[in-house]
């Protein structure tokens, strides 16, 4: 059974946030994705979405937040750039299904976005500059703004049993601590 | 240590198919995306698709949309790769390949590869 | 599709000899670019991750440099056990691509 999980990032400011969500491609590849922050007892709240219907690898900008729905894989990218650290926070994908409530994607992204100098060697500051070099479309937030009452908004539980660490050879630049946490099972 | 270990040479007819598996093990195997490359003999690398392991999403290059099931058994962490409709420029070595960072990050490094699987597909 | 070039396709060089190949991406691809090792009949290893970070366990006279749309292996000192083939891989996008490789073999 699919377990829903938070992975977490670790990154200083002025870094890029580069994750994927992905989605079953027969039923979603055209649907209208979006990129919300949790913050706990409100509401999801939307910060940037794909156009409706959503066009396959076409940058969409909305302010430091570009999305790029990759139709052909099932993949949706989504790339926070020049990170501060009220960026800090729970994020999740979700894919817009009126009317019925958004269809959640694993897995939710908890950000910490800590003060410091990010330009060591092998820092993702560089991939700032990626961003910008194809003119995105900036949009305004044209998202539907409905979200499920049901979306679980709580911390997921402390227990340590089921949370799997990075192998310890892993070097990932930056990204200095993935933990998946399950939220529930 | 983290260990991919794939299923033995096939030889298939044309039009046949074939379906390698891919064992996981020393890493939590739903936390990382499985891809698969293949090479040519004397050619080079061809990336053909990924699957997310967790959600049992994946998706695949366009030459080989219409002929490629990526699925995996989380129970005994195998991803298997099918490829259809074989003809003869499928001959290769297969590989699966674990990427260097968790499922969500977009940080395609391939890190952790298979030994490869021959395919031979000759009439 | 990201087009992505080696050059040379192959090359004879000496034990200690500096050795360096490059690898050019069709439009910019920012600092996204893999380099890997493939000894005959083996698979890939890699080498180097986000043009220029070393992996975990490769000797230090492997480096990579670049950003945008060129890129440089280097091997600072070759050894025998260097002899391999070696590829450029980038992950701007999707479809990921890879170089046609790179032949090194000892003069």
């Known amino acids: 059974a699919t377990k829903l999980t938070e992975e977490k990032y670790e990154l200083k400011e002025g870094q890029t946030l580069d994750v994927k969500c992905d989605y079953t491609l027969e039923k979603f590849a055209s649907s209208q994705k979006a990129w919300q922050i949790i913050r706990d007892g409100e509401m999801p709240k939307t910060l940037a979405c794909t156009e409706r219907p959503s066009k396959n690898s076409h940058p969409v900008q909305v302010g430091r937040i570009i999305l790029e729905d990759y139709h052909d894989h099932g993949l949706l990218r989504v790339r926070m750039v020049n990170l501060q650290v009220e960026d800090s926070g729970l994020y999740q994908c979700v894919i817009y299904q009126p009317p019925k409530e958004p269809h959640m994607l694993f897995d939710r992204i908890r950000l910490v976005v800590t003060k410091g100098f990010s330009g060591t060697p092998g820092s993702n500051e560089n991939s700032t500059q990626n961003v910008y070099k194809i003119p995105p479309t900036t949009t305004k937030a044209l998202c539907p703004l409905y979200t499920s009452p049901r979306t679980v908004t709580q911390a997921p539980p402390k227990s340590t049993a089921d949370v799997s660490t990075p192998d310890s050879e892993i070097n990932l630049t930056n990204v200095t601590d993935i933990i998946r946490v399950p939220v529930f099972n | 240590q983290v260990q991919l270990v794939q299923s033995g040479a096939e030889v298939k007819k044309p039009g046949a198919s074939v379906k390698v598996s891919c064992k996981a093990s020393g890493y939590t195997f739903t936390s990382y995306d499985i891809n698969w490359v293949r090479q040519a003999t004397g050619q080079g690398l061809e990336w053909m698709g990924w699957?997310?392991?967790?959600?049992?999403?994946?998706g695949s290059v366009k030459k080989f949309r219409d002929r490629v099931t990526m699925t995996r058994d989380t129970s005994i962490s195998t991803a298997y790769m099918e490829l259809s409709s074989l003809r003869s420029e499928d001959t290769a070595v297969y590989y699966c390949?674990?990427?260097?960072?968790?499922?969500?990050?977009?940080?395609?490094?391939?890190?952790?590869w298979g030994q490869g699987t021959l395919v031979t597909v000759s009439s | 599709d990201i087009q992505m070039t080696q050059s040379p396709s192959s090359l004879s060089a000496s034990v200690g000899d500096r050795v360096t190949i490059t690898c050019q991406a069709s439009r910019d691809i920012s600092k996204y670019l893999n380099w890997y090792q493939q000894k005959p009949g083996k698979a890939p290893k890699l080498l180097i991750y986000?043009?220029?970070n070393l992996e975990t366990g490769v000797p230090s006279r492997f480096s990579g440099s670049g950003s945008g749309t060129d890129f440089t292996f280097t091997i600072s000192s070759l050894q025998p056990e260097d002899i391999a083939t070696y590829y450029c891989?980038?992950?701007?996008?999707?479809?990921?691509?890879f170089g046609q490789g790179t032949r090194l073999e000892i003069k």
């Open positions: 390949v674990r990427l260097i960072g968790y499922s969500s990050a977009f940080k395609w490094s391939f890190q952790h």
């Open positions: 699957m997310n392991p967790n959600s049992g999403n994946s």
């Open positions: 891989q980038h992950y701007d996008n999707i479809p990921i691509t």
């Open positions: 986000d043009a220029s």
